[in-house]
């Protein structure tokens, strides 16, 4: 910070609540889309420019005036891999976290005109180009269609789609949210010959029902009904198919070939959890038992003579966990070598750290190519010579991220490509590789202002800065900004990391109120080196509140000993550790222990509520937004991963003694603000309704706010501003701030 260390002498403005809500200070991104191994697209003043990666020169790919007469507001665009067509998306209507419907038109870049014949229907649920050429697959009314050419009629692939019952090529609610993190359940083969797809059957899945109040003029609220399996309830079933798009014809129905789950899955409830094409005619599928400690990878080959797909049992790879669940949230995806005969995959090693293992498809055992008391976050690219990955190895900081390359001919030859580029400013990187990994964009997101740079893989030299946020830097020079501290405490001989957003001119000899910002879900991380402008920035800058976060037991990227500590025991150690963290912070000398608060959203709302209901005496007040209150109310896939089933033979006891409601009496000792959106499809309003009822039943006075027709994000412009204003008032009142 420029200016003096003395707060009273610093005349600069602070970062205000209005600054946060109105996004006064905007971080600039540099969002590129690679279209080849040496070219990318970038949107500038609504023109789409094509850039040469090596030399940095650009030309206009598409002028912003092209669609002036289009008559619709274009939400997004997508260029066919051969560069001949552009898919225009409009009439966007959000459904859940990832899903939406939209209208689409196709523009012929050669003829410079919209294709008017055989258009994709309105309310299409998903569209995707084939990986090469310009075939299109789309889902409409829960059925799949394929276009061989944009101007040709669609071939219908499935005929069974039925709203809320049978989903072809798209996910149902729980698969979208908890398994694939996507609406799409379609996978093109690399050359676009085959289209693989999943079919989900929700016939027996119970419905969650909630009111949607809509416009004031609506006399009777609408009832929203969504198939949503809660813990222990009937789950969707899944089938998997592959269709050869070369064989499609108008006069005969498409033949989809089913690939069935392995026998070890068919014995009970199971999930399809990963689909990866290995070659043009080889596909890998990962299946997961409902009890998510056992998964199987099948590798299936196309048999041209029969038109079938064969999955040899000898090529099955089993992944299991004896201490918890498989994967961070699900089994990791394999990265196949060019010949499809081997692959690299992130799995837990003997010590419980997630590292890269090299598999040959015909061998059971794998060879770890990385090791250490740190974790590989993701495999980013694979070439014939190198594998590129992101890890948190550097300086032993789990909250950092750097890009590495490992030589495939000698696993001892590992190079960190980002560690020393800008070590003060940049400790948290993500990457975007060109099509064949000849070039890559590094995206540094902290601790300094975000920095986007372009690099060549040939010699790993930096080519140019794409965006350095210098304009924002200049603006923030005139603002009293908080500082961020990232450190660890040691509890039971284990390092646990925390971060603190410290007020400007922080003075460790003074006493500050502290707000604990919590999530604390399995495999979460809140202590990191990312630069953020958020509510905490306002609280620290303007209100002089320390905003801290702590990664206790259950948190991720530090090995399974920490992460699996809460296996089958949600609501225990991760809750206790937040309380202990607050105690430790109190002892640091600069925290006013009479003014400690806690807040969280979603899982963080659950932990906040459990903490406030613990009777610890550490916290004066807290805010829970859209909290879970009882695990039987939440979805099966997420909940059972960590808790098993709510049956007497499995884990019913802990389901029942980990509720917020059972702690209602202790809320008399704290000030509590409970907030929830009435149209939350994810953590249902039911969860807060039950907290409220329990508190009322024992005579606890508390504050509450609902947000009509808002979902789990409470993200509409007005609601977003309202909730943060409301929470600010609550925290200021709790801390006796003017």
């Amino acid at each position: 910070n420029k200016g003096t260390d003395d707060a009273t002498a610093d005349s600069r403005k602070t970062y205000t609540l209005t600054d946060y809500l109105k996004n006064t200070y905007r971080l600039k991104l540099y969002s590129l889309r690679w279209i080849s191994d040496h070219e990318y697209l970038y949107k500038q003043e609504n023109n789409i420019l094509v850039f040469n990666a090596e030399y940095g020169n650009s030309s206009v790919f598409l002028e912003n005036s092209t669609f002036d007469e289009f008559g619709h507001s274009i939400n997004d665009y997508s260029i066919s891999p051969d560069g001949q067509f552009i898919l225009l998306e409009y009439n966007y209507v959000k459904q859940w976290r990832h899903s939406y419907t939209a209208s689409y038109d196709i523009y012929d870049l050669n003829k410079r005109q919209l294709i008017t014949e055989e258009r994709i229907p309105n309310n299409t649920q998903w569209v995707t180009w084939s990986p090469v050429g310009h075939k299109l697959a789309y889902v409409w009314n829960n059925d799949i269609y394929v276009k061989i050419e944009p101007n040709l009629p669609s071939y219908r692939i499935t005929w069974t789609g039925k709203e809320d019952i049978i989903y072809n090529g798209i996910t149902d609610w729980v698969y979208e949210e908890e398994v694939f993190s996507a609406y799409s359940a379609l996978w093109w083969s690399p050359n676009g010959t085959f289209l693989a797809y999943a079919q989900f059957n929700d016939t027996e899945v119970p419905l969650i029902e909630y009111s949607f109040y809509s416009d004031e003029s609506l006399q009777y609220p609408k009832t929203v009904r969504v198939p949503y399996p809660k813990a222990g309830a009937v789950n969707p079933t899944v089938k998997f198919f592959v269709v050869n798009t070369d064989s499609l014809s108008s006069v005969t129905n498409a033949t989809s070939i089913q690939i069935t789950a392995p026998a070890s899955m068919l014995i009970g409830d199971h999930y399809l959890c990963d689909v990866t094409w290995a070659t043009q005619e080889r596909i890998s599928l990962q299946w997961l038992r409902r009890i998510q400690n056992y998964s199987v990878m099948d590798i299936c080959d196309y048999d041209e003579s029969s038109g079938r797909w064969n999955c040899l049992v000898a090529r099955q790879h089993i992944e299991m966990s004896t201490t918890g669940w498989v994967g961070r949230f699900r089994p990791s995806e394999p990265h196949f070598t060019l010949d499809g005969n081997s692959f690299y995959k992130i799995i837990s090693n003997e010590e419980g750290y997630r590292h890269i293992c090299y598999f040959q498809i015909d061998k059971k055992d794998c060879t770890f190519i990385t090791k250490g008391t740190w974790e590989v976050i993701g495999i980013e690219a694979l070439t014939s010579d190198y594998l590129y990955y992101i890890s948190n190895e550097y300086k032993g900081m789990p909250g950092g991220r750097n890009l590495y390359k490992i030589q495939l001919s000698d696993y001892t030859k590992v190079t960190c490509l980002s560690c020393e580029l800008n070590p003060e400013r940049c400790q948290y990187y993500s990457v975007s590789f060109s099509k064949e990994a000849k070039y890559y964009q590094l995206r540094c997101s902290g601790p300094g202002l975000p920095l986007y740079t372009l690099h060549s893989s040939v010699n790993d030299k930096g080519l140019r800065v794409l965006e350095d946020n210098s304009a924002l830097d200049k603006m923030l020079q005139n603002v009293q900004m908080p500082s961020k501290k990232l450190d660890f405490i040691i509890l039971n001989e284990t390092k646990f990391w925390y971060q603190m957003i410290l007020p400007p001119h922080f003075d460790k000899s003074k006493k500050y109120p502290l707000l604990l910002d919590v999530y604390a879900g399995p495999c979460s991380q809140k202590a990191d080196t990312v630069f953020r402008l958020n509510w905490a920035t306002y609280l620290a800058s303007t209100e002089n509140i320390i905003v801290a976060s702590f990664d206790g037991r259950g948190s991720g990227y530090q090995g399974d000993k920490i992460m699996h500590a809460i296996n089958r025991r949600l609501g225990t150690f991760e809750v206790e550790d937040q309380i202990e963290a607050a105690r430790q912070f109190s002892k640091m000398g600069f925290v006013d222990n009479k003014r400690i608060a806690i807040w969280g959203w979603s899982y963080g709302g659950y932990v906040t509520s459990m903490v406030l209901g613990s009777g610890s005496g550490v916290f004066k007040c807290g805010i829970a937004v859209a909290p879970v209150s009882r695990w039987e109310y939440y979805d099966s896939v997420y909940t059972e991963r960590y808790m098993g089933l709510p049956t007497p033979e499995d884990n019913l006891d802990h389901y029942r003694n980990s509720t917020v409601m059972s702690r209602a009496e202790n809320f008399k000792q704290v000030e509590y603000l409970l907030i929830h959106g009435t149209a939350d499809d994810n953590v249902h309003f039911q969860q807060s309704a039950q907290i409220s009822k329990a508190l009322v039943d024992v005579g606890v006075d508390f504050q509450a706010m609902w947000y009509t027709d808002e979902d789990h994000g409470i993200a509409s412009s007005t609601a977003h501003q309202h909730i943060y204003t409301h929470m600010s008032h609550f925290i200021k009142q709790c801390f006796s701030l003017p």
């Epitope: 061989i148 064989s247 014809s249 108008s250 033949t255 038109g307």
Partner: antibody
């Protein structure tokens, strides 16, 4: 390279059975349908039937009772069998590859003469 | 069955001239119409698929248009090597049917 090579034509007696062969290369018969058409001397093209990639068959009603189309995918070969030949079956017979809704590759044709 | 009526049955034009062949379907077939060229003593070959799409390798002087019941094949500038019979074919419904053909000759 995609090719369809035909064999099996020649002179037949009325009432005999015809078996034509169409050997495919450069593509798989499990993916693509194979159609058969015929062309009587000096006339147009007449569709006979098809065997689809998955083995299902469809025929023109005029041939349904005496035509069978089959294939041996291991030999990449499709067959047209026609029973109870008559003089009006004299024609050049073509096999073609079905690509979506059109015929993109044709065999060279094989001449069948039905004469006593 | 869908009947395809082709006209004219033959046409004669000078090189460089425009030649137009029409094909009328007995019922609507959307755009599911293909055109084939058959040179004397040869197998037919695909020219145009789905009413207006030029098959790879076919000269750009050939073009197709139409939808529903009325379709046209146009040779913008007739060349000597275009002497052949031309057939339309519908692919919307089994049995597939062909037009009766148009013989194109050079004057």
């Amino acid at each position: 390279e995609v090719q369809l090579v035909q064999s099996g034509g020649g002179v037949k007696q009325p009432g005999e059975t015809l078996r034509l062969t169409c050997t495919a290369s450069g593509f798989s018969l499990t993916t693509y349908g194979v159609h058969w058409v015929r062309q009587a001397p000096g006339k147009g093209l007449e569709w006979v039937g098809v065997i689809w990639g998955d083995g299902r068959t469809d025929y023109d009603a005029a041939f349904m009772s005496r035509v069978t189309i089959s294939k041996d995918t291991s030999k990449s070969t499709a067959y047209l069998q026609m029973n109870s030949l008559r003089a009006e079956d004299t024609a050049v017979y073509y096999c073609m590859r079905n690509r979506h809704d059109w015929f993109d590759y044709w065999g060279q044709g094989t001449t069948v003469t039905v004469s006593s | 069955d869908i009947l395809l009526t082709q006209s004219p049955s033959s046409l004669s034009a000078t090189p460089g001239e425009r030649a137009t062949i029409t094909c009328r379907a007995s019922q609507g077939i959307r755009n599911n119409l293909n055109w084939y060229q058959q040179k004397p003593g040869q197998a037919p070959r695909l020219l145009i698929y789905y009413s207006s799409n030029l098959q790879s390798g076919v000269p750009s002087r050939f073009s197709g248009s139409g939808s529903g019941t009325d379709f046209t094949l146009t040779i913008s500038r007739l060349q000597p090597e275009d002497v052949a019979a031309y057939y339309c074919q519908q692919s919307i419904k089994l049995p597939f049917t062909f037009g009766s053909g148009t013989k194109v000759e050079i004057k």
